[in-house]
C-alpha cells in the first residue's frame, strides 16, 4: 500500500525440538478482534492457512499442522506441540475487523547434538607424508541448526594452515530434519605430535544460550624414522654368574626397526650375531663369564634398508672360579699342626673365610687357616668361602675333610634300654676313628653297617629279646688298625609302673643318633618309653 511503513521485524520465538511453541498473536485491540483471527504458516514465501479462530473458538485446517495446534490464553495464543526442525518458519496471525492487520512470528528451532564421536586414523600418520593426512574425524549427530566444530591440539584451537592443517566439514540431513555434522581433520604431523592430545568441540545454540560439547581426548599413532639406537642391560649394576641378564636393543623410531645384537669376538676381532627372542631381546640365563664382552645393536629400516649402529656396550659378568684347597684330603696325627690354603680367581677382589662345617663358626678371615695341636675333635669338615664383597651373592665354596688318626671312639660307653620279652629289638651303635673302624656285636642277629662320613660308622642290629639276653646285655665293639673300643647296652624289662598315662598311645619305633663330637648318646630303637635316668 503506497505510503505504508515497512513491515516490522517478526517477533522471535525460540524452542527446542519436541517441545511446545507458544505463538502469541500480538495484534492490539485496535488492529483487530482476537476472537476472529486466521493463522498462516509461511514457507518459501507461500502462505498456508493452518488455523481459524471464530468467536474465540479454534479450528485446525487439514494438513501437516492439523493434529498439533490448539488455542490457549483465551484465544490469544496458538500452541504448536511436538516441534520439529521443519517448523522453523514464519507464522502470522491476521485479524479480520475493523481492518485486516497481521502480526508475524519467526519460530526458531534448536536441538543439541549428541556427544561428539571422535575417531583416530586406525593406521596412524607418517611424518614424512607429502600432503596432509586424515588424522581424525569428529561426528556430531542430530543437532539443529548445524553445530560449529573446533579442533584442538594440546588444548589450543587448530587453525587452517596451507599444506599443514585442513579441516573438512560436511553435513547430512536426517529424515527427522536434524543435521549430522562430520568434520575431518587433515594435517601433516611431526614427531613431537606422538604425545599430542587432540579433541573436537561442537558449539551450538539453544533457547537458553550458547553451549558446547567436547569429545574425549585422543592421541594419534605417529610414525617417524629411527635416528638413534642404543642398548640397555637389565638388571642394572654389577652382574654375576647365574643372573638372568637381558640385553635389549632400543630405538627412537616408530614403529621400532628390525634389530640384531652382535658380540665382538676378541680372538677373531669380528662381531658374531647373537640369537635374540621375538622382541629382539638377548636373554642370558644363566649368565656366564664367557658372556662378558662388547655388544652392539644394529637397527634396520626394512623399507629403506638403511641400518644404524648403537654405541658398543661392555658387558662384564662377574665370576668366582672353582675354589681350590690344599691339601685336598688332609690326614694328621693328634697333637700335630696343619695349614690349609684356599685359592680362587675372580673378576673382582676376593675375600676368603674359613668356617667349621658343623657349626658354621668363622675360624679365619683370609685364604690361610692354621691349626695347631690337633685334637681328635678337630676332625671333620672345614669350608673355604671365596666371595666378592661388592656383589652380594657372588661366592663359591669348597669343603675339605680333616681326618685325625686315632683308635675307635664310641658315641657312648654304656646305655640302658627298656624292652619287653620276645620283642624284636633294633639296637644301634656308633663309632668314629681314622682309619674308619668296623663294628661287631657279641650276640647273633641281623646287623647292617652304614658310613656316616669317612671317619664315622653306624651299625644297627635286629635281635629277639630272650631271658639270656636280658641277663647278659649286648656289647658292640669297634676296631681299626690303631685299636678297639666297646659299648655296652643293658636291657631292662618294662613294668607297668614305668609307663606314663599316655605313653601306651605311642607305638611307633624311633631312632635317634648323636654326633660323637658332642658325646651325646646314641639310642637303640624300640617302643618310645620315658627315660628313667640320664644316660651317660
Amino acid at each position: 500500500v503506497p505510503g505504508e511503513a515497512e513491515q516490522p521485524a517478526p517477533e522471535l520465538v525460540e524452542v527446542e525440538v519436541g517441545s511446545t511453541a507458544l505463538l502469541k498473536c500480538g495484534l492490539s485491540q485496535s488492529q483487530g478482534n482476537l476472537s476472529h483471527v486466521d493463522w498462516f504458516s509461511v514457507h518459501k514465501e507461500k502462505r498456508t492457512l493452518i488455523f481459524r479462530v471464530r468467536q474465540g473458538q479454534g479450528q485446525s485446517e487439514p494438513g501437516e499442522y492439523e493434529q498439533r495446534l490448539s488455542l490457549q490464553d483465551r484465544g490469544a495464543t496458538l500452541a504448536l506441540t511436538q516441534v520439529t526442525p521443519q517448523d522453523e518458519r514464519i507464522f502470522l496471525c491476521q485479524g479480520k475487523r475493523p481492518r485486516s492487520q497481521e502480526y508475524r512470528i519467526q519460530l526458531r528451532v534448536y536441538k543439541a547434538p549428541e556427544e561428539p564421536n571422535i575417531q583416530v586414523n586406525p593406521l596412524g600418520i607418517p611424518v614424512n607424508s607429502k600432503e596432509p593426512e586424515e588424522v581424525a574425524t569428529c561426528v556430531g549427530r542430530n543437532g539443529y541448526p548445524i553445530p560449529q566444530v573446533i579442533w584442538y591440539k594440546n588444548g589450543r584451537p587448530l587453525k587452517e594452515e596451507k599444506n599443514r592443517v585442513h579441516i573438512q566439514s560436511s553435513q547430512t540431513v536426517e529424515s527427522s530434519g536434524l543435521y549430522t555434522l562430520q568434520s575431518i581433520l587433515k594435517a601433516q604431523l611431526v614427531k613431537e605430535d606422538k604425545d599430542a592430545q587432540f579433541y573436537c568441540e561442537l558449539n551450538y545454540r539453544l533457547p537458553s544460550g550458547n553451549h558446547m560439547k567436547e569429545s574425549r581426548e585422543v592421541t594419534v599413532p605417529v610414525f617417524y624414522p629411527t635416528e638413534k639406537v642404543w642398548l640397555e642391560v637389565e638388571p642394572v649394576g654389577m652382574l654375576k654368574e647365574g643372573d638372568r641378564v637381558e640385553i635389549r636393543c632400543l630405538a627412537d623410531g616408530n614403529p621400532p626397526p628390525h634389530f640384531s645384537i652382535s658380540k665382538g669376538n676378541p680372538s677373531t676381532r669380528e662381531a658374531e650375531e647373537e640369537t635374540t627372542n621375538d622382541n629382539g631381546v638377548l636373554v642370558l640365563e644363566p649368565a656366564r663369564k664367557e658372556h662378558s664382552g662388547r655388544y652392539e645393536c644394529q637397527a634396520w629400516n626394512l623399507d629403506t634398508m638403511i641400518s644404524l649402529l648403537s654405541e658398543p656396550q661392555e658387558l662384564l659378568v662377574n665370576y668366582v672360579s672353582d675354589v681350590r684347597v690344599s691339601p685336598a684330603a688332609p690326614e694328621r696325627q693328634e697333637g700335630s699342626s696343619l695349614t690349609l690354603t684356599c685359592e680362587a680367581e675372580s673378576s673382582q677382589d676376593l675375600e676368603f673365610q674359613w668356617l667349621r662345617e658343623e657349626t658354621d663358626q668363622v675360624l679365619e678371615r683370609g685364604p690361610v687357616l692354621q691349626l695347631h695341636d690337633l685334637k681328635r675333635e678337630a676332625g671333620g669338615g672345614y669350608r673355604c668361602v671365596a666371595s666378592v664383597p661388592s656383589i652380594p651373592g657372588l661366592n663359591r665354596t669348597q669343603l675339605v675333610k680333616l681326618a685325625i688318626f686315632g683308635p675307635p671312639w664310641m658315641a657312648f660307653k654304656e646305655r640302658k634300654v627298656w624292652v619287653k620279652e620276645n620283642m624284636v629289638l633294633n639296637l644301634s651303635c656308633e663309632a668314629s676313628g681314622h682309619p674308619r673302624p668296623t663294628i661287631s656285636w657279641n650276640v647273633n642277629g641281623t646287623a647292617s653297617e652304614g658310613d656316616q662320613d669317612p671317619q664315622r660308622v653306624l651299625s644297627t642290629l635286629n635281635v629277639l629279646v630272650t631271658p639270656e639276653l636280658l641277663e647278659t646285655g649286648v656289647e658292640c665293639t669297634a676296631s681299626n688298625d690303631l685299636g678297639k673300643n666297646t659299648s655296652i647296652l643293658f636291657l631292662e624289662l618294662v613294668n607297668l609302673t614305668t609307663l606314663t598315662p599316655d605313653s601306651n598311645t605311642t607305638t611307633g619305633l624311633s631312632t635317634s643318633t648323636a654326633s660323637p663330637h658332642t658325646r651325646a648318646n646314641s639310642t637303640s630303637t624300640e617302643r618310645k618309653l620315658p627315660e628313667p635316668e640320664s644316660r651317660g
Epitope: Q119, P122, P126, S129, E131, P132, E134, T137
Partner: antibody, heavy 116, light 106 residues
Framework: QVTLKESGPVLVKPTETLTLTCTVS????????VSWVRQPPGKALEWIAA???????YYNSAFKSRLTISRDTSKSQVVLTMTNMDPVDTATYYC??????????WGQGTLVTVSS | DIQMTQSPSSLSASVGDRVTITCKGS??????LAWFQLKPGKVPKLLIY???SLQTGIPSRFSGSGSGTDFTLTISSLQPEDVATYYC????????FGGGTKVEIK
C-alpha cells in the same frame, strides 16, 4: 556412482609374485584411501594393506616383507604386489574404499589360486 | 592386535524372525565398528558404521548398537534376501574382522 574392480591372474605358482590391480571410478584416489582385504576359502576376512589419500602406505605386519602397494592417480588404479606366493595365499582378494576410516564401497573380489 | 570375536558362527531362523549377532572386542574400541554383509559373487555391502549408524540405502530392519567392547547387529524381521555371511570389523587400531556369522532361512 562409486565402483571398484579388481583384476589380475586367477592362478599363480608357488614362489611366484602376484600383482593385482584395483581400478576405481566415482571418486579420486587423492580424496580417499584404498585398502586390500582377502578371504581364504571358508575363513574370515583379513586386511592386507592400504594406501592413503596422501599416498602413505600401510601393511599388515604378518605379510609386510612380501607386500608393496602403490597407486597411479592418473589411471585411478591401486596396485598390490605380493611376493613368494604360497598355497595358503589362495583367497578372494578385494579392494575397498575408505570413508574416511571404515570401508564404504568394495569391489566384487577376484579369486586367486596358488598351485603348481 | 585387537581381536574381534563374533557369535554365533551360524544360525538358522524363519522369515520374519528377529535375528541378533554379537561381536566382542579384546579391548575398548569405543564406537569404531562396522558391520558388513557378504554374499557369494556379490560386492560386499556396508550395513552399519560407527557402531550404530545405518549406511545410506540399507533397509531400516538392520540396526547396530553397542560401544566399548560389546556390539550387536540386529535384523528386526528376517527376509529371504538377508541370507548371507555377516562380519564385524574394528577400525580403532588397524583393521581386524570377526570370524563371521552365516545366516540361513529355516
Amino acid at each position: 556412482q562409486v565402483t571398484l574392480k579388481e583384476s589380475g591372474p586367477v592362478l599363480v605358482k608357488p614362489t611366484e609374485t602376484l600383482t593385482l590391480t584395483c581400478t576405481v571410478s566415482g571418486f579420486s584416489l587423492t580424496s580417499n584411501a584404498v585398502s586390500w582385504v582377502r578371504q581364504p576359502p571358508g575363513k574370515a576376512l583379513e586386511w592386507i594393506a592400504a594406501i592413503s589419500s596422501g599416498g602413505s602406505t600401510y601393511y599388515n605386519s604378518a605379510f609386510k616383507s612380501r607386500l608393496t602397494i602403490s597407486r597411479d592417480t592418473s589411471k585411478s588404479q591401486v596396485v598390490l604386489t605380493m611376493t613368494n606366493m604360497d598355497p595358503v595365499d589362495t583367497a578372494t582378494y578385494y579392494c575397498a574404499r575408505h570413508r574416511p576410516f571404515y570401508f564404504d564401497y568394495w569391489g566384487q573380489g577376484t579369486l586367486v589360486t596358488v598351485s603348481s | 592386535d585387537i581381536q574381534m570375536t563374533q557369535s554365533p558362527s551360524s544360525l538358522s531362523a524363519s522369515v520374519g524372525d528377529r535375528v541378533t549377532i554379537t561381536c566382542k572386542g579384546s579391548q575398548n574400541i569405543y564406537k569404531s565398528l562396522a558391520w558388513f554383509q557378504l554374499k557369494p559373487g556379490k560386492v560386499p555391502k556396508l550395513l552399519i558404521y560407527d557402531a550404530n549408524s545405518l549406511q545410506t540405502g540399507i533397509p531400516s530392519r538392520f540396526s547396530g548398537s553397542g560401544s566399548g567392547t560389546d556390539f550387536t547387529l540386529t535384523i528386526s524381521s528376517l527376509q529371504p534376501e538377508d541370507v548371507a555371511t555377516y562380519y564385524c570389523q574394528q577400525y580403532y587400531s588397524g583393521y581386524t574382522f570377526g570370524g563371521g556369522t552365516k545366516v540361513e532361512i529355516k
